[in-house]
Protein backbone atom coordinates (compact mmCIF):
# COMPACT_ATOMS: atom_id res chain seq x y z
CA UNK A 1 0.00 0.00 0.00
CA UNK A 2 1.44 3.35 -1.08
CA UNK A 3 0.42 6.98 -1.29
CA UNK A 4 0.04 8.06 -4.91
CA UNK A 5 -0.84 11.74 -4.26
CA UNK A 6 0.34 13.15 -0.94
CA UNK A 7 -2.19 14.77 1.40
CA UNK A 8 -3.07 18.38 0.70
CA UNK A 9 -5.01 20.27 3.33
CA UNK A 10 -7.12 23.40 3.52
CA UNK A 11 -8.33 25.21 6.65
CA UNK A 12 -11.48 27.20 7.35
CA UNK A 13 -9.33 29.30 9.74
CA UNK A 14 -11.63 28.42 12.56
CA UNK A 15 -11.97 24.82 13.66
CA UNK A 16 -11.85 22.44 10.69
CA UNK A 17 -9.18 21.50 8.19
CA UNK A 18 -9.83 19.07 5.36
CA UNK A 19 -7.07 16.87 3.97
CA UNK A 20 -7.34 14.83 0.77
CA UNK A 21 -5.01 12.29 -0.79
CA UNK A 22 -4.94 9.38 -3.22
CA UNK A 23 -3.69 5.85 -2.71
CA UNK A 24 -2.12 3.68 -5.40
CA UNK A 25 -5.18 1.44 -5.59
CA UNK A 26 -8.71 0.93 -4.27
CA UNK A 27 -8.66 1.45 -0.50
CA UNK A 28 -11.16 1.24 2.32
CA UNK A 29 -9.94 4.46 3.89
CA UNK A 30 -11.86 4.20 7.16
CA UNK A 31 -10.69 0.68 8.03
CA UNK A 32 -7.19 0.68 6.58
CA UNK A 33 -5.86 4.19 7.29
CA UNK A 34 -5.46 6.69 10.12
CA UNK A 35 -4.25 10.29 9.93
CA UNK A 36 -2.56 11.42 13.14
CA UNK A 37 -2.18 15.15 13.64
CA UNK A 38 -0.77 17.36 16.37
CA UNK A 39 -0.33 21.08 16.84
CA UNK A 40 3.33 21.93 17.46
CA UNK A 41 2.65 23.49 20.84
CA UNK A 42 3.64 22.80 24.42
CA UNK A 43 0.05 22.17 25.55
CA UNK A 44 -1.14 20.09 22.59
CA UNK A 45 -1.93 16.41 22.28
CA UNK A 46 -2.06 14.03 19.32
CA UNK A 47 -5.40 13.46 17.61
CA UNK A 48 -6.55 10.75 15.23
CA UNK A 49 -8.71 11.33 12.16
CA UNK A 50 -10.57 8.42 10.56
CA UNK A 51 -10.64 9.10 6.83
CA UNK A 52 -13.59 8.58 4.51
CA UNK A 53 -13.53 7.35 0.94
CA UNK A 54 -13.52 9.98 -1.78
CA UNK A 55 -13.67 7.92 -4.94
CA UNK A 56 -12.06 4.51 -5.37
CA UNK A 57 -8.50 5.36 -4.36
CA UNK A 58 -9.17 8.76 -2.79
CA UNK A 59 -9.43 9.53 0.91
CA UNK A 60 -10.58 12.61 2.81
CA UNK A 61 -10.19 13.52 6.49
CA UNK A 62 -11.85 16.31 8.44
CA UNK A 63 -9.50 17.45 11.20
CA UNK A 64 -11.02 19.12 14.26
CA UNK A 65 -8.62 21.82 15.43
CA UNK A 66 -8.19 24.42 18.12
CA UNK A 67 -9.06 27.99 17.10
CA UNK A 68 -6.47 28.87 14.47
CA UNK A 69 -3.79 31.55 14.85
CA UNK A 70 -1.30 32.53 12.17
CA UNK A 71 1.74 30.83 13.75
CA UNK A 72 0.09 27.41 14.02
CA UNK A 73 1.87 24.43 12.49
CA UNK A 74 0.58 20.86 12.57
CA UNK A 75 2.49 17.63 12.09
CA UNK A 76 0.69 14.99 10.02
CA UNK A 77 1.38 11.24 10.02
CA UNK A 78 -0.51 8.88 7.73
CA UNK A 79 -0.56 5.30 9.01
CA UNK A 80 -1.71 1.98 7.59
CA UNK A 81 -1.71 -0.20 10.70
CA UNK A 82 1.88 -0.10 12.01
CA UNK A 83 3.28 1.22 8.72
CA UNK A 84 4.01 4.95 8.38
CA UNK A 85 3.05 5.79 4.79
CA UNK A 86 3.69 9.52 4.83
CA UNK A 87 4.88 12.26 7.18
CA UNK A 88 4.36 15.97 6.64
CA UNK A 89 3.28 19.26 8.13
CA UNK A 90 0.55 21.82 7.55
CA UNK A 91 0.27 25.53 8.35
CA UNK A 92 -3.45 26.37 8.35
CA UNK A 93 -2.84 30.09 7.76
CA UNK A 94 -1.11 29.33 4.46
CA UNK A 95 -3.96 27.24 3.04
CA UNK A 96 -7.23 28.96 3.87
CA UNK A 97 -10.62 28.41 2.30
CA UNK A 98 -13.12 30.60 4.18
CA UNK A 99 -16.45 29.32 5.36
CA UNK A 100 -19.40 30.18 3.13
CA UNK A 101 -21.56 33.14 4.16
CA UNK A 102 -25.05 32.25 5.38
CA UNK A 103 -28.55 33.63 5.79
CA UNK A 104 -28.68 35.35 2.42
CA UNK A 105 -31.87 37.43 2.32
CA UNK A 106 -33.28 39.67 -0.38
CA UNK A 107 -35.31 42.61 0.93
CA UNK A 108 -37.64 43.87 -1.77
CA UNK A 109 -39.75 46.31 0.26
CA UNK A 110 -37.33 49.23 -0.09
CA UNK A 111 -38.59 51.58 -2.78
CA UNK A 112 -37.31 50.23 -6.09
CA UNK A 113 -34.10 49.10 -4.41
CA UNK A 114 -33.03 45.55 -3.73
CA UNK A 115 -31.17 45.07 -0.47
CA UNK A 116 -29.27 41.81 -0.16
CA UNK A 117 -27.90 40.92 3.26
CA UNK A 118 -26.03 37.89 4.53
CA UNK A 119 -24.15 36.80 7.62
CA UNK A 120 -20.41 36.84 8.13
CA UNK A 121 -19.49 33.18 8.76
CA UNK A 122 -16.95 34.04 11.48
CA UNK A 123 -17.35 35.21 15.08
CA UNK A 124 -16.07 38.72 15.88
CA UNK A 125 -12.97 37.42 17.68
CA UNK A 126 -11.77 35.55 14.59
CA UNK A 127 -9.12 37.34 12.52
CA UNK A 128 -11.05 36.78 9.28
CA UNK A 129 -14.17 38.48 10.63
CA UNK A 130 -12.86 41.91 9.66
CA UNK A 131 -11.01 40.80 6.53
CA UNK A 132 -13.62 39.16 4.31
CA UNK A 133 -14.79 40.59 1.02
CA UNK A 134 -17.58 39.07 -1.02
CA UNK A 135 -18.86 38.29 -4.49
CA UNK A 136 -22.60 38.23 -5.08
CA UNK A 137 -23.91 36.25 -8.05
CA UNK A 138 -27.38 37.09 -9.38
CA UNK A 139 -28.96 35.23 -12.25
CA UNK A 140 -32.28 34.81 -13.98
CA UNK A 141 -34.00 31.47 -13.88
CA UNK A 142 -35.53 32.19 -17.27
CA UNK A 143 -32.52 33.51 -19.14
CA UNK A 144 -29.11 31.79 -18.67
CA UNK A 145 -27.41 34.79 -20.29
CA UNK A 146 -28.73 37.09 -17.55
CA UNK A 147 -25.92 36.29 -15.10
CA UNK A 148 -23.98 38.90 -13.15
CA UNK A 149 -21.37 39.19 -10.40
CA UNK A 150 -21.14 42.09 -7.94
CA UNK A 151 -17.90 42.48 -6.00
CA UNK A 152 -18.43 43.70 -2.45
CA UNK A 153 -15.06 45.07 -1.37
CA UNK A 154 -16.25 46.80 1.80
CA UNK A 155 -16.68 44.93 5.08
CA UNK A 156 -20.42 45.21 5.54
CA UNK A 157 -22.20 42.02 4.42
CA UNK A 158 -24.78 43.73 2.27
CA UNK A 159 -25.40 44.91 -1.28
CA UNK A 160 -27.86 47.49 -2.62
CA UNK A 161 -28.83 47.52 -6.27
CA UNK A 162 -31.57 49.29 -8.17
CA UNK A 163 -34.37 46.88 -8.99
CA UNK A 164 -34.45 48.43 -12.45
CA UNK A 165 -31.02 46.99 -13.26
CA UNK A 166 -32.81 43.63 -13.44
CA UNK A 167 -35.74 42.71 -15.63
CA UNK A 168 -39.17 43.19 -14.15
CA UNK A 169 -41.72 40.43 -13.80
CA UNK A 170 -39.34 37.48 -13.66
CA UNK A 171 -37.69 35.39 -10.95
CA UNK A 172 -34.05 35.77 -9.95
CA UNK A 173 -31.73 33.85 -7.71
CA UNK A 174 -28.74 35.10 -5.72
CA UNK A 175 -25.84 33.50 -3.89
CA UNK A 176 -22.73 34.87 -2.18
CA UNK A 177 -19.20 33.70 -1.48
CA UNK A 178 -16.25 35.12 0.45
CA UNK A 179 -12.49 35.43 0.38
CA UNK A 180 -9.79 37.20 2.40
CA UNK A 181 -6.95 39.02 0.67
CA UNK A 182 -4.79 39.11 3.81
CA UNK A 183 -4.17 35.36 3.69
CA UNK A 184 -4.51 35.07 -0.10
CA UNK A 185 -7.30 32.57 0.46
CA UNK A 186 -9.24 30.67 -2.14
CA UNK A 187 -12.90 31.56 -2.54
CA UNK A 188 -15.35 29.94 -0.18
CA UNK A 189 -18.10 27.71 -1.49
CA UNK A 190 -21.22 29.58 -2.61
CA UNK A 191 -23.91 30.10 -0.02
CA UNK A 192 -27.26 28.41 -0.62
CA UNK A 193 -29.15 30.49 -3.17
CA UNK A 194 -32.27 32.49 -2.45
CA UNK A 195 -35.07 33.27 -4.91
CA UNK A 196 -37.28 36.31 -5.39
CA UNK A 197 -39.67 37.73 -7.96
CA UNK A 198 -38.39 41.02 -9.32
CA UNK A 199 -41.04 43.63 -9.91
CA UNK A 200 -40.87 47.40 -9.90
CA UNK A 201 -42.87 50.32 -11.23
CA UNK A 202 -41.68 51.46 -14.64
CA UNK A 203 -41.21 55.25 -14.58
CA UNK A 204 -43.73 57.16 -16.72
CA UNK A 205 -42.20 58.33 -19.98
CA UNK A 206 -41.96 62.09 -20.31
CA UNK A 207 -43.25 63.44 -23.66
Amino acid sequence: MKVLQEPTCVSDYMSISTCEWKMNGPTNCSTELRLLYQLVFLLSEAHTCIPENNGGAGCVCHLLMDDVVSADNYTLDLWAGQQLLWKGSFKPSEHVKPRAPGNLTVHTNVSDTLLLTWSNPYPPDNYLYNHLTYAVNIWSENDPADFRIYNVTYLEPSLRIAASTLKSGISYRARVRAWAQCYNTTWSEWSPSTKWHNSYREPFEQH
Epitope: S44, E45, D66, D67, V69, S70, A71, D125
Partner: antibody
Framework: EVQLVESGGGLVHPGGSLRLSCAAS????????MFWVRQAPGKGLEWVSG???????SYADSVKGRFTISRDNAKNSLYLQMNSLRAEDTAVYYC?????????WGQGTLVTVSS | EIVLTQSPGTLSLSPGERATLSCRAS???????LAWYQQKPGQAPRLLIY???SRATGIPDRFSGSGSGTDFTLTISRLEPEDFAVYYC??????????FGQGTKVEIK
Protein backbone atom coordinates in the same frame (compact mmCIF):
# COMPACT_ATOMS: atom_id res chain seq x y z
CA GLU B 1 -17.58 40.11 22.79
CA VAL B 2 -14.85 38.11 24.51
CA GLN B 3 -15.08 38.36 28.30
CA LEU B 4 -12.90 36.85 31.02
CA VAL B 5 -13.93 37.47 34.61
CA GLU B 6 -11.73 36.32 37.48
CA SER B 7 -12.94 35.70 41.03
CA GLY B 8 -11.80 34.02 44.23
CA GLY B 9 -9.00 36.34 45.28
CA GLY B 10 -8.59 37.57 48.83
CA LEU B 11 -6.44 37.55 51.96
CA VAL B 12 -4.93 34.23 53.02
CA HIS B 13 -2.33 33.22 55.62
CA PRO B 14 1.02 31.72 54.55
CA GLY B 15 0.60 27.99 54.03
CA GLY B 16 -3.07 28.45 53.23
CA SER B 17 -5.05 27.64 50.10
CA LEU B 18 -7.20 29.55 47.62
CA ARG B 19 -9.08 28.63 44.47
CA LEU B 20 -9.35 31.15 41.68
CA SER B 21 -12.01 30.96 38.96
CA CYS B 22 -12.29 32.54 35.55
CA ALA B 23 -15.65 32.70 33.78
CA ALA B 24 -15.28 32.90 30.01
CA SER B 25 -17.81 34.03 27.40
CA UNK B 26 -17.98 35.32 23.84
CA UNK B 27 -15.91 32.54 22.27
CA UNK B 28 -15.71 28.76 22.01
CA UNK B 29 -13.95 28.03 25.27
CA UNK B 30 -13.28 24.36 24.50
CA UNK B 31 -11.17 25.21 21.43
CA UNK B 32 -8.78 27.51 23.25
CA UNK B 33 -5.78 27.11 25.52
CA MET B 34 -6.14 29.13 28.72
CA PHE B 35 -3.61 30.67 31.08
CA TRP B 36 -2.94 32.33 34.41
CA VAL B 37 -0.50 35.25 34.50
CA ARG B 38 0.30 37.17 37.68
CA GLN B 39 1.74 40.53 38.63
CA ALA B 40 3.16 41.27 42.08
CA PRO B 41 2.52 44.82 43.35
CA GLY B 42 4.75 47.25 41.46
CA LYS B 43 6.44 44.41 39.57
CA GLY B 44 6.33 42.90 36.08
CA LEU B 45 4.25 40.14 34.51
CA GLU B 46 4.95 36.48 35.27
CA TRP B 47 3.40 33.53 33.45
CA VAL B 48 2.05 31.06 36.04
CA SER B 49 0.33 28.18 34.26
CA GLY B 50 -1.43 27.07 31.11
CA UNK B 51 -3.85 24.35 30.06
CA UNK B 52 -4.48 23.06 26.55
CA UNK B 53 -7.79 22.07 24.99
CA UNK B 54 -7.16 18.42 25.78
CA UNK B 55 -6.13 19.08 29.36
CA UNK B 56 -2.33 19.11 29.01
CA UNK B 57 -0.82 21.46 31.58
CA SER B 58 2.37 23.42 32.21
CA TYR B 59 3.60 25.40 35.21
CA ALA B 60 6.24 27.97 36.04
CA ASP B 61 8.97 26.53 38.26
CA SER B 62 7.99 28.95 41.02
CA VAL B 63 4.57 27.30 41.47
CA LYS B 64 5.19 23.71 40.37
CA GLY B 65 3.87 21.20 42.89
CA ARG B 66 1.80 23.84 44.71
CA PHE B 67 -0.62 25.14 42.07
CA THR B 68 -3.02 23.12 39.90
CA ILE B 69 -4.73 24.47 36.79
CA SER B 70 -7.96 22.88 35.54
CA ARG B 71 -10.86 23.65 33.24
CA ASP B 72 -14.54 22.77 32.91
CA ASN B 73 -15.58 23.15 29.28
CA ALA B 74 -19.24 22.54 30.13
CA LYS B 75 -19.16 25.57 32.43
CA ASN B 76 -16.79 27.67 30.28
CA SER B 77 -14.61 28.02 33.35
CA LEU B 78 -10.90 27.99 34.20
CA TYR B 79 -9.57 27.35 37.70
CA LEU B 80 -6.35 27.70 39.65
CA GLN B 81 -6.05 25.75 42.90
CA MET B 82 -3.29 27.36 44.97
CA ASN B 83 -1.90 25.46 47.96
CA SER B 84 1.03 26.13 50.35
CA LEU B 85 0.79 29.83 49.59
CA ARG B 86 3.77 32.07 50.30
CA ALA B 87 4.19 35.81 50.75
CA GLU B 88 5.83 35.97 47.30
CA ASP B 89 2.61 34.65 45.71
CA THR B 90 0.95 37.98 46.53
CA ALA B 91 -0.14 39.40 43.19
CA VAL B 92 -2.96 40.27 40.85
CA TYR B 93 -3.82 37.06 38.99
CA TYR B 94 -5.02 37.44 35.42
CA CYS B 95 -6.87 34.87 33.36
CA UNK B 96 -5.81 34.98 29.70
CA UNK B 97 -6.82 33.35 26.45
CA UNK B 98 -4.23 32.70 23.78
CA UNK B 99 -1.54 30.34 22.65
CA UNK B 100 1.91 31.68 21.86
CA UNK B 101 0.85 35.12 23.07
CA UNK B 102 -2.19 36.49 24.90
CA UNK B 103 -4.66 38.67 22.98
CA UNK B 104 -7.41 38.50 25.62
CA TRP B 105 -7.12 39.21 29.36
CA GLY B 106 -9.45 39.49 32.30
CA GLN B 107 -9.23 42.42 34.71
CA GLY B 108 -7.54 40.31 37.41
CA THR B 109 -8.20 39.28 41.00
CA LEU B 110 -5.93 40.23 43.89
CA VAL B 111 -4.42 37.53 46.09
CA THR B 112 -2.73 38.71 49.28
CA VAL B 113 -0.70 36.24 51.34
CA SER B 114 0.07 37.71 54.74
CA SER B 115 0.04 36.77 58.39
CA GLU C 1 14.71 29.14 30.48
CA ILE C 2 14.90 32.00 28.01
CA VAL C 3 15.48 35.35 29.73
CA LEU C 4 14.22 38.54 28.10
CA THR C 5 16.01 41.77 29.05
CA GLN C 6 14.33 45.06 28.19
CA SER C 7 16.11 48.36 27.91
CA PRO C 8 16.03 51.06 28.93
CA GLY C 9 14.22 50.54 32.23
CA THR C 10 12.65 53.98 31.90
CA LEU C 11 12.33 56.19 28.84
CA SER C 12 11.57 59.90 29.42
CA LEU C 13 10.15 61.52 26.31
CA SER C 14 7.76 64.26 25.23
CA PRO C 15 4.57 63.81 23.22
CA GLY C 16 5.33 63.77 19.50
CA GLU C 17 8.76 62.21 19.99
CA ARG C 18 9.82 58.77 18.74
CA ALA C 19 10.20 55.95 21.27
CA THR C 20 12.47 52.98 20.67
CA LEU C 21 12.23 50.08 23.12
CA SER C 22 14.61 47.12 23.07
CA CYS C 23 14.09 43.48 24.05
CA ARG C 24 17.07 41.13 24.06
CA ALA C 25 16.75 37.34 24.50
CA SER C 26 19.33 35.12 26.20
CA UNK C 27 19.01 32.71 23.27
CA UNK C 28 17.43 32.81 19.84
CA UNK C 29 13.64 33.27 19.75
CA UNK C 30 11.39 32.49 16.81
CA UNK C 31 9.95 35.73 15.43
CA UNK C 32 6.57 33.99 15.22
CA UNK C 33 6.47 33.78 19.00
CA LEU C 34 7.58 37.28 20.09
CA ALA C 35 4.93 39.72 21.32
CA TRP C 36 4.70 43.21 22.87
CA TYR C 37 2.13 44.47 25.39
CA GLN C 38 1.15 47.85 26.80
CA GLN C 39 -0.04 48.19 30.39
CA LYS C 40 -1.47 51.25 32.10
CA PRO C 41 -1.88 51.56 35.89
CA GLY C 42 -4.78 49.51 37.24
CA GLN C 43 -5.45 47.89 33.87
CA ALA C 44 -4.77 44.50 32.31
CA PRO C 45 -2.05 44.30 29.66
CA ARG C 46 -3.07 44.90 26.04
CA LEU C 47 -1.51 43.01 23.14
CA LEU C 48 0.13 45.43 20.69
CA ILE C 49 2.36 43.32 18.45
CA TYR C 50 2.57 39.58 17.77
CA UNK C 51 4.84 37.60 15.50
CA UNK C 52 7.49 40.31 16.17
CA UNK C 53 5.96 42.71 13.64
CA SER C 54 2.20 42.18 13.19
CA ARG C 55 -0.11 44.71 14.82
CA ALA C 56 -2.94 43.28 16.88
CA THR C 57 -6.53 44.23 16.05
CA GLY C 58 -7.28 47.89 16.69
CA ILE C 59 -3.68 48.95 17.33
CA PRO C 60 -2.73 52.28 15.66
CA ASP C 61 -0.06 52.17 12.97
CA ARG C 62 2.28 54.39 14.97
CA PHE C 63 3.21 51.18 16.80
CA SER C 64 5.59 48.90 14.93
CA GLY C 65 7.72 45.91 15.82
CA SER C 66 10.89 44.55 14.25
CA GLY C 67 13.81 42.25 14.88
CA SER C 68 14.81 38.61 14.79
CA GLY C 69 16.98 36.10 16.61
CA THR C 70 17.86 37.66 19.95
CA ASP C 71 17.19 41.36 19.30
CA PHE C 72 13.72 42.84 18.98
CA THR C 73 12.46 46.42 18.92
CA LEU C 74 9.15 48.16 19.56
CA THR C 75 8.91 51.60 17.97
CA ILE C 76 6.29 54.26 18.63
CA SER C 77 6.74 56.74 15.79
CA ARG C 78 5.07 59.74 17.46
CA LEU C 79 4.10 59.50 21.10
CA GLU C 80 0.53 60.39 21.92
CA PRO C 81 -0.49 61.29 25.51
CA GLU C 82 -2.22 57.91 25.88
CA ASP C 83 0.98 56.02 24.99
CA PHE C 84 2.72 56.75 28.29
CA ALA C 85 2.63 53.37 30.00
CA VAL C 86 4.72 50.28 30.74
CA TYR C 87 5.64 48.03 27.81
CA TYR C 88 6.52 44.32 28.06
CA CYS C 89 7.96 41.91 25.53
CA UNK C 90 7.04 38.23 25.79
CA UNK C 91 8.22 35.06 24.11
CA UNK C 92 7.04 31.49 23.77
CA UNK C 93 9.31 28.48 23.41
CA UNK C 94 8.12 24.92 22.73
CA UNK C 95 10.13 23.54 25.64
CA UNK C 96 10.64 26.49 28.00
CA UNK C 97 7.15 27.93 27.82
CA UNK C 98 6.28 31.61 28.21
CA UNK C 99 8.44 34.40 29.62
CA PHE C 100 8.09 38.17 29.91
CA GLY C 101 10.68 40.87 29.96
CA GLN C 102 10.87 43.05 33.09
CA GLY C 103 9.22 46.00 31.32
CA THR C 104 10.11 49.48 30.07
CA LYS C 105 8.30 52.48 31.49
CA VAL C 106 7.66 55.27 29.00
CA GLU C 107 7.09 58.46 31.01
CA ILE C 108 6.45 62.08 30.15
CA LYS C 109 9.61 64.19 30.20
Amino acid sequence: EVQLVESGGGLVHPGGSLRLSCAASGFTFSRNAMFWVRQAPGKGLEWVSGIGTGGATSYADSVKGRFTISRDNAKNSLYLQMNSLRAEDTAVYYCARGRYYFPWWGQGTLVTVSS
Amino acid sequence: EIVLTQSPGTLSLSPGERATLSCRASQSVSSSYLAWYQQKPGQAPRLLIYGASSRATGIPDRFSGSGSGTDFTLTISRLEPEDFAVYYCQQYDHSAGWTFGQGTKVEIK
